[in-house]
């Protein structure tokens, strides 16, 4: 089965930088997964911003703002890669990534 | 001294348009997410319109959806409120007011620095 | 959307009195997301109390809020006579809009 890292627990960035978070897949290759990321505001529900599919494709929720969220994978390192863009205060959250495994 | 400055009121018939700017000063206007509050004469705050510090994300009042438009220019330290289709419930003093923005405590929120407002009246 | 209904809609008190002004949301706001305001005539607003308990820059302290879900309290220990103003309670929740309370009137007995 496959499982999931997120080896960064915390990221700080000044204001309008960039963030790169990295979700780490073991047990299983990545490249015939899904990686899904998700945010949770703090006292809101999680919410799906993006996701990556086994053949590349990409999927991003209706209603986020565009530009805002890139997600990527590196097959060498087994890792997908959300950027966010611009960094807001509105973009504060706590982000997780999840698999699918086809 | 942090100070918001609103224009761009005036009088103006239903179906006209209106262009509110807000000025900023003393602070960095580009680290702020900004609103738009109104109040109709007589009446509560009605919170208008959003938008984030890179202009990301903008929500609006169901009331404006569709007719008015929020923009800023960090360069020029500026919040405009475009207002098309203007109807005679439009009519009310509309002020820009800045988010607290991102200290330690960022979970927080709430309008800190209000502008005086400036008037809009839609009548024929 | 979330509605917030303030109570009283009018409190009469005289200076040095206790006023404790309430404000309920239709569904659970967290704490971080609510926020209270003052507001004079023919003044703007001002910020008094930001996630729910914190008080805002120069607010004095016998101004304090509380509360959590969906009942918040806004209580003022001593009234001063410059605290008679109308008050508006405010949240942002999950997502717009920004709704405020339709104000309490705090008025001299």
């Known amino acids: 089965a496959g499982h999931l890292e997120q080896p960064q627990i915390s990221s700080t960035k000044t204001l309008s930088k960039t963030a790169r978070l990295e979700c780490v897949v073991s047990g299983i290759t990545i490249s015939a997964t899904s990686v899904y990321w998700y945010r949770e505001r703090p006292g809101e529900v999680i919410q799906f911003l993006v996701s990556i599919s086994y053949d590349g494709t990409v999927r991003k929720e209706s209603g986020i703002p565009s530009g805002k969220f890139e997600v990527d994978r590196i097959p060498e390192t087994s890792t997908s890669t959300l950027t966010i863009h611009n960094v807001e205060k509105q973009d504060i959250a706590t982000y997780y990534c999840a698999l699918w495994e086809v | 001294e942090v100070q918001l400055v609103e224009s761009g009121g005036g009088l103006v018939k239903p179906g006209g348009s209106l262009r509110l700017s807000c000025s900023a000063s003393g602070f960095t206007f580009s680290n702020y997410d900004m609103n738009w509050v109104r109040q109709a004469p007589g009446k509560g705050l009605e919170w208008v319109s959003s938008i984030s510090s890179s202009s990301s994300y903008i929500y609006y009042a169901d009331s404006v959806k569709g007719r008015f438009t929020i923009s800023r220019d960090n360069a020029k330290n500026s919040l405009y409120l475009q207002m098309n289709s203007l109807r005679a419930e439009d009519t009310a003093v509309y002020h820009c007011a800045r988010d607290v923005g991102v200290t330690t405590d960022y979970y927080y929120y709430g309008m800190d620095v209000w502008g005086q407002g400036t008037t809009v009246t839609v009548s024929s | 959307d979330i509605v917030m209904t303030q109570s009283p809609g009018t409190l009469s008190l005289s200076p040095g009195d206790r006023a404790t002004l309430s404000c309920r949301a239709s569904?659970?706001?967290?704490?971080?997301?609510l926020a209270w305001y003052q507001q004079k005539p023919g003044q703007s607003p001002r910020l008094l109390i930001y996630?729910?308990?914190s008080r805002a820059t120069g607010i004095p302290d016998r101004f304090s809020g509380s509360g959590s879900g969906t009942d918040f309290t806004l209580t003022i220990s001593r009234l001063e006579p410059e605290d008679f103003a109308v008050y508006y309670c405010?949240?942002?929740?999950?997502?717009?809009?920004?709704?405020f309370g339709q104000g309490t009137k705090v008025e001299i007995k």
């Open positions: 996630g729910a308990s």
């Open positions: 405010q949240q942002y929740g999950s997502s717009p809009p920004y709704t």
């Open positions: 569904q659970s706001v967290a704490s971080s997301y």
